[in-house]
């Protein structure tokens, strides 16, 4: 079935949400973010086999052409379908501010 | 500079729009599309080195974590930032119809 959630490569091998624990230093944020000191970063990782979580028609085309011309056309790629917001306490020219970032943490994933 | 368009890997090696000539058979559409018989498929192909066409903060995070944990976190991936529509003449149960698809052809690319 199209847009399937059953991974043919085995459990956990296909495109899905992963959580990676990271410090401000890991993220390269230590010079401008004060808090949080550590972040549970959610990101999209995994393979995109045929018909698995295909985002759209373009992803279907890409997979078909990848099968035909694997050296020219890469397979679809696992990327965020949407994001969860996150509030950072950050340094500013005038002091410190609260700021919402809409595109920091992946919420769910698909193949494009 | 962030979101740079200068490819550090050499001309044409980084994430950009490519055109791939494909027939209906190549696309797996021969059984339901009548026209066009051939399509100039625009898609996003290429590497995503640090700070190249970063789509958002998530892409920056992903690149930083990829540098730290390359076996766990993949590099950002070259995907469409937007699409161009395309009209297909397609077979239907009752005959033939014109249908616009908004997500077939990549218009521009970025790294996520």
């Amino acid at each position: 079935a199209r847009n399937g959630d059953r991974c043919p490569l085995g459990p956990g091998r296909c495109c899905r949400l992963h959580t990676v624990h990271a410090s401000l230093e890991d993220l390269g944020w230590a010079d401008w973010v004060l808090s949080p000191r550590e972040v549970q970063v959610t990101m999209c990782i995994g393979a995109c086999p045929s018909q698995f979580r295909e985002a759209n028609m373009h992803a279907q085309i890409k997979m078909n052409l990848h099968r035909l011309k694997p050296d020219t056309v890469p397979a679809p790629c696992c990327v965020p379908a949407s994001y969860n917001p996150m509030v950072l306490i950050q340094k500013t020219d005038t002091g410190v501010s609260l700021q919402t970032y809409d595109d920091l943490l992946a919420k769910d994933c698909h193949c494009v | 500079a962030r979101n740079g368009d200068r490819c550090p890997l050499g001309p044409g090696r980084c994430c950009r729009l490519h055109t791939v000539h494909a027939s209906l058979e190549d696309l797996g559409w021969a059984d339901w599309v009548l026209s066009p018989r051939e399509v100039q498929v625009t898609m996003c192909i290429g590497a995503c080195p640090s700070q190249f066409r970063e789509a958002n903060m998530h892409a920056q995070i992903k690149m930083n974590l990829h540098r730290l944990k390359p076996d766990t976190v993949p590099a950002p991936c070259c995907v469409p930032a937007s699409y161009n529509p395309m009209v297909l003449i397609q077979k239907t149960d009752t005959g033939v119809s014109l249908q616009t698809y908004d997500d077939l052809l990549a218009k521009d690319c970025h790294c996520v």
């Epitope: 004060l34 808090s35 917001p85 509030v87 306490i89 501010s97 609260l98 700021q99 919402t100 809409d102 | -």
Partner: antibody, heavy 118, light 107 residues
Framework: DVKLVESGEGLVKPGGSLKLSCAAS????????MSWVRQTPEKRLEWVAY????????FYADTVKGRFTISRDNARNTLYLQMSSLKSEDTAMYYC???????????WGQGTLVTVSA | SIVMTQTPKFLPVSAGDRVTMTCKAS??????VAWYQQKPGQSPKLLIY???NRYTGVPDRFTGSGSGTDFTFTISSVQVEDLAVYFC?????????FGAGTKLELK
């Protein structure tokens, strides 16, 4: 059920001081950032101050900076607002609000009225 | 700070009407706008957050839309119990700011 109960209302002369309290119950107080929001007699809503869950970061509206102090006692499940050098324009209903981490206000107390008048 | 300009100030309605009010931010706030309802003698109540997400228990006649600087709040079919003041708020950055409110009143 989440409950926020403000106290400390009063009539104060300009230049005077007043301390408001907010007793929280029905949730783990120490896990949430908190804010004070006030509503003027003209019914305008104004964010006043914000404090992180551990009290390590504090933010104020420019109109109250240097005069108001937000604090919390996580052991007592209580939020405070110490107001000094009060002005007539500080006259308002003061609400205690819980921040669920996204800078909007899903939970409000019933409010406590502060009147600054000679 | 970000100024939230809310219009109109007053909105005369009849039961069953579809009504729309708008909020304009002085700078891009993404989709970081919330809408609140306040009835006389009560505290404000959160209806919408992230411009279009309905808060728990809020009836589906209340909808929000918009992004960037222009936001809209709609009640598809006004009920008598919806007569109240509605406020928008940007939850993008400090200082957090509210619109001046739109009062829904009977025609």
């Amino acid at each position: 059920d989440v409950k926020l109960v403000e106290s400390g209302e009063g009539l104060v002369k300009p230049g005077g001081s007043l301390k408001l309290s907010c007793a929280a119950s029905g949730f783990t107080f120490s896990s949430f950032a908190m804010s004070w929001v006030r509503q003027t007699p003209e019914k305008r809503l104004e964010w006043v101050a914000y404090i992180t869950s551990g009290g390590d970061y504090i933010f104020y509206a420019d109109t109250v900076k240097g005069r108001f102090t937000i604090s919390r006692d996580n052991a007592r499940n209580t939020l405070y607002l110490q107001m000094s050098s009060l002005k007539s324009e500080d006259t308002a209903m003061y609400y205690c609000t819980r921040d669920d981490g996204y800078l909007w206000f899903a939970y409000w107390g019933q409010g406590t009225l502060v009147t600054v008048s000679a | 700070s970000i100024v939230m300009t809310q219009t109109p100030k007053f909105l005369p309605v009849s039961a069953g009407d579809r009504v729309t009010m708008t909020c304009k931010a002085s700078q891009n706030v993404g989709n970081n706008v919330a809408w609140y309802q306040q009835k006389p003698g009560q505290s404000p109540k959160l209806l919408i957050y992230y411009a279009s997400n309905r808060y728990t228990g809020v009836p589906d006649r209340f909808t929000g839309s918009g992004s960037g600087t222009d936001f809209t709040f709609t009640i598809s079919s006004v009920q008598v119990e919806d007569l109240a003041v509605y406020f928008c708020q940007q939850h993008y950055s400090s200082p957090l700011t509210f619109g001046a409110g739109t009062k829904l009143e009977l025609k």
